[in-house]
């Protein structure tokens, strides 16, 4: 067990803060919940601190909760390969390019760590280039989310992991906008990080409304299971 | 750091076509996507084109249709085939390159006047 690891075997806190920026549309979102390790589970409630969120919701998800990969659960033969635990508690830094098919791009950086016994998420995103009619700043996605796969990669020159996925965000007209996910996260700390061998992230995310909640906001669950990466032969002939 | 060097820009009659070259040089790996945006005078910068790793390609409003954009992985080189060009086509066109982190890489630019 690496010793941030050791920081995750129960439920752990967690806030959100996010400073946006799109088409010089400005926006801030805070969020808060809980992550649990031991089964990969998140739930988190954000608030549009700022009136209406100029973006929908689902284009957001993967800065929020994909930014604390930290909560994903790897199975005892994989934890070997579990970078976002072994960065902590100073944590790393998570940056991102999205491109949406046909319309803009978020940049995206995060820094993820412990306060006290709290995992903060701080982000910045940018976004530029973006239709106004569009699918993202015209809101015409559905507020609800897909399945994924989240393919990590080590980093060993920059002694952390490279990220890649692509995104589905279903669209009102029953049509999909897609979304290419780059991402490069790198501990904050200079203590020692598992980097590891090539596997992928599986995550189910459900969204819903606070029916008490007056202000533009996100209810989000969401599980993360690491695999990708086979028991080893010493496994097989136990 | 990144080199971007465009060419192929110059002058053309309304309805020809042009393409332009964007040749990547450096740290190439770092890079995620290239893309090709335009300025004419007076007016902002506008997005284009933009091709990411994956192959993912994306086309501003006024490329639709009639630019395609296209990548030669053993040069290093990025192509913008522009068709039916109109006079409103005329600006600097701009290579652009992106990297995960904030902050991106830049040409120098190429005029395109169609006239």
């Known amino acids: 067990m690496s010793k941030g690891e050791e920081l995750f075997t129960g439920v752990v806190p967690i806030l959100v803060e996010l400073d946006g920026d799109v088409n010089g549309h400005k926006f801030s979102v805070s969020g808060e919940g809980e992550g649990d390790a031991t089964y990969g589970k998140l739930t988190l409630k954000f608030i549009c601190t700022t009136g209406k969120l100029p973006v929908p919701w689902p284009t957001l998800v993967t800065t929020f909760s994909y930014g604390v990969q930290c909560f994903s659960r790897y199975p005892d033969h994989m934890k070997q390969h579990d970078f976002f635990k072994s960065a902590m508690p100073e944590g790393y830094v998570q940056e991102r390019t999205i491109f949406f098919k046909d319309d803009g791009n978020y940049k995206t950086r995060a820094e993820v760590k412990f306060e006290g016994d709290t995992l903060v998420n701080r982000i910045e995103l940018k976004g530029i280039d973006f239709k106004e009619d569009g699918n993202i700043l015209g809101h015409k996605l559905e507020y609800n989310y897909n399945s994924h796969n989240v393919y990590i990669m080590a980093d060993k020159q920059k002694n952390g992991i490279k990220v890649n996925f692509k995104i589905r965000h279903n669209i009102e007209d029953g049509s999909v906008q897609l979304a290419d996910h780059y991402q490069q996260n790198t501990p904050i700390g200079d203590g020692p990080v598992l980097l590891p061998d090539n596997h992928y992230l599986s995550t189910q995310s459900a969204l819903s409304k606070d029916p008490n909640e007056k202000r533009d906001h996100m209810v989000l669950l969401e599980f993360v299971t690491a695999a990708g990466i086979t028991h080893g032969m010493d496994e097989l002939y136990k | 750091d990144v080199q971007l060097v465009e060419s192929g820009g110059g002058l053309v009659q309304p309805g020809g076509s042009l393409r332009l070259s964007c040749a990547a040089s450096?740290?190439?790996?770092?890079?995620?996507?290239i893309g090709w945006y335009r300025q004419a005078p007076g007016k902002q910068r506008e997005s284009v084109a933009l091709?990411?790793?994956?192959?993912?390609?994306t086309y501003g409003d006024s490329a639709q249709g009639r630019f395609t954009i296209s990548r030669d992985d053993a040069k290093n080189t990025v192509y913008l085939h522009m068709d039916d060009l109109v006079p409103e086509d005329t600006a600097v066109y701009y290579c652009?390159?992106?990297?995960?982190?904030?902050?991106?890489?830049w040409g120098q630019g190429t005029q395109v006047t169609v006239s």
């Open positions: 652009n390159a992106k990297k995960v982190s904030f902050g991106d890489y």
């Open positions: 091709i990411t790793r994956s192959g993912m390609i």
């Open positions: 450096g740290e190439i790996a770092s890079i995620i996507a």
